[in-house]
């Protein structure tokens, strides 16, 4: 931009150098050149000479008018045509910006990733503002009434050391720019309810050579949380439909989950967990790929109607990826329930 230009006059913008996108804008240029009575005053936008809607107000001043200015940024400068000068003479320049006041931040979520030592809050910022916009995160203790504020750009990590005095907080986000301010809805947070267990990892898988081969998937987490509820989703690499199994897990030892899968197929497994009864899920773990062994006696096999599906305290359901381009976005299509209640409807990816 033109920030350190030596002006021989002045340039100003109405309604201001930062204005709401779509507004009508007037830009004025006033020369104060020595030894020059300009024949003409010219306006340039981003280096290109403007031809239309220019008015000469008096000997020293001209104005250019823009109807419904909608460019986020422009570099304006004006020049004078001085008699006897071969080149135009620079008068002044200005950076101008147009944008929108911020939307109210929405979908405010705060979580504590186990062992991180931070409460991480995220939100949706809404439509682009095109101008510098700050986010102020307010954290108010419901017990001591003390309020803290944090400046953020799109998320904030707040050390749990600064949240020692209380367990219950009110959190909200203020979006601020030069065109306006909006507040999010307030979020009630209890620190004990927002912990997400330490990452779950699938470490290995093996398929047995039994008459009915079974695949055992081994998975673990370093979590110290006692009651953990997990989902494992799995599908062949050629399929778009995931099956989901639910587990109550105790990570004092490595978890083993048994599956009766189609032979000679490549499967993808992912797992995620949450503290039992809480709402925040881990992101799905990294995809773990396992090739099942070939079977001698072939049969037409359906993993969700087979009598060989291992049934313990799990629920199995199906979810289908919306498109092959978005394998992580899940939508519940149908649920074939083997036991207990349907799988959690919250099958979208968090991570």
């Amino acid at each position: 931009g033109i920030t350190s230009i030596n002006c021989s006059g002045d340039m100003w913008v109405e309604p201001g150098e930062i204005f709401q996108m779509g507004m009508n804008v007037s830009i004025y240029c006033q020369e104060a050149l020595k030894h020059c009575r300009p024949r003409n005053l010219y306006f340039y936008k981003n280096g290109f000479k403007e031809e239309f809607d220019i008015t000469r107000i008096n000997r020293t001043t001209a104005r250019i008018w823009y109807k419904g200015f909608s460019e986020p940024h422009a570099y304006m400068h004006c020049t004078a045509e001085c008699p006897g000068h071969f080149q135009e003479t620079l008068i002044c320049g200005k950076d101008i910006s147009s944008g929108h006041p911020p939307d109210a931040p929405s979908n405010l979520t705060c979580v504590i990733y186990e062992y991180s030592g931070n409460m991480t809050c995220t939100w949706n910022t809404g439509k682009p503002t095109y101008i510098d916009t700050k986010y102020i995160v307010h954290v108010k203790s419901l017990e001591t009434e003390e309020e803290q504020q944090y400046l953020a750009s799109s998320y904030v990590k707040i050390s749990t050391d600064s949240l020692q005095g209380s367990r219950k907080y009110l959190v909200w986000v203020q979006a601020v720019n030069s065109l306006g301010m909006e507040n999010s809805q307030q979020l009630h947070v209890h620190l004990d309810d927002i912990v997400i267990p330490s990452a779950s990892i699938i470490s290995r898988a093996e398929t047995t050579n039994d008459t009915v081969p079974k695949t055992i998937v081994y998975w673990k987490s370093k979590t110290m949380i006692e009651k953990v509820f997990c989902e494992m989703r799995y599908k062949t690499t050629t399929n778009q439909t995931w099956s989901v199994k639910e587990f109550d897990a105790n990570f004092t030892y490595v978890q083993q989950s048994e599956f009766y899968l189609e032979p000679d197929s490549k499967y993808v497994f992912q797992v995620r967990c949450q503290e039992t009864g809480k709402r925040n899920w881990q992101p799905w773990s990294s995809p773990f790929v396992h090739q099942t062994s070939q079977e001698t006696g072939k049969r037409n096999w359906q993993p969700w109607s087979s009598p060989f599906v291992h049934q313990t305290s799990q629920t199995v359901s199906q979810v289908t990826a919306k498109s092959s381009h978005e394998p992580q976005k899940m939508e519940m299509l149908s649920a074939t329930i083997f036991r207990g209640h349907p799988a959690s409807g919250n099958h979208q990816d968090i991570g």
């Epitope: 930062i18 910006s97 700050k134 400046l151 600064s162 601020v176 720019n177």
Partner: nanobody
Amino acid sequence: QVQLQESGGGSVQAGGSLRLSCAASGYTYSSCTMGWYRQAPGKERELVSMLISDGSTFYADSVKGRFTFSQENAKSTVYLQMNSLKPEDTAMYYCGCATLGSRTVWGQGTQVTVSS
């Protein structure tokens, strides 16, 4: 850690003017997003004005056209020029230094009282 010290408050009649100053000391001042805030008795602290970026300043609707935020980088000082003061402007005024991801640091505040 930055330290902030406000001054310039006082009592004034409605329609009068005051100029608040906030002097910052400490090595982090240059990375501060500076703002003026106020807290009236029994109310939440509210943002009055904030320097968003070069040439871009936020003003609360209630003070737009009456208050002007300015800064003098060489002196690490920011100002709030308050004109056409109203009784509802009566509050404790604080300047704040906010840096990304860190807790906002406040000054001790300066009292502004506007009588009708």
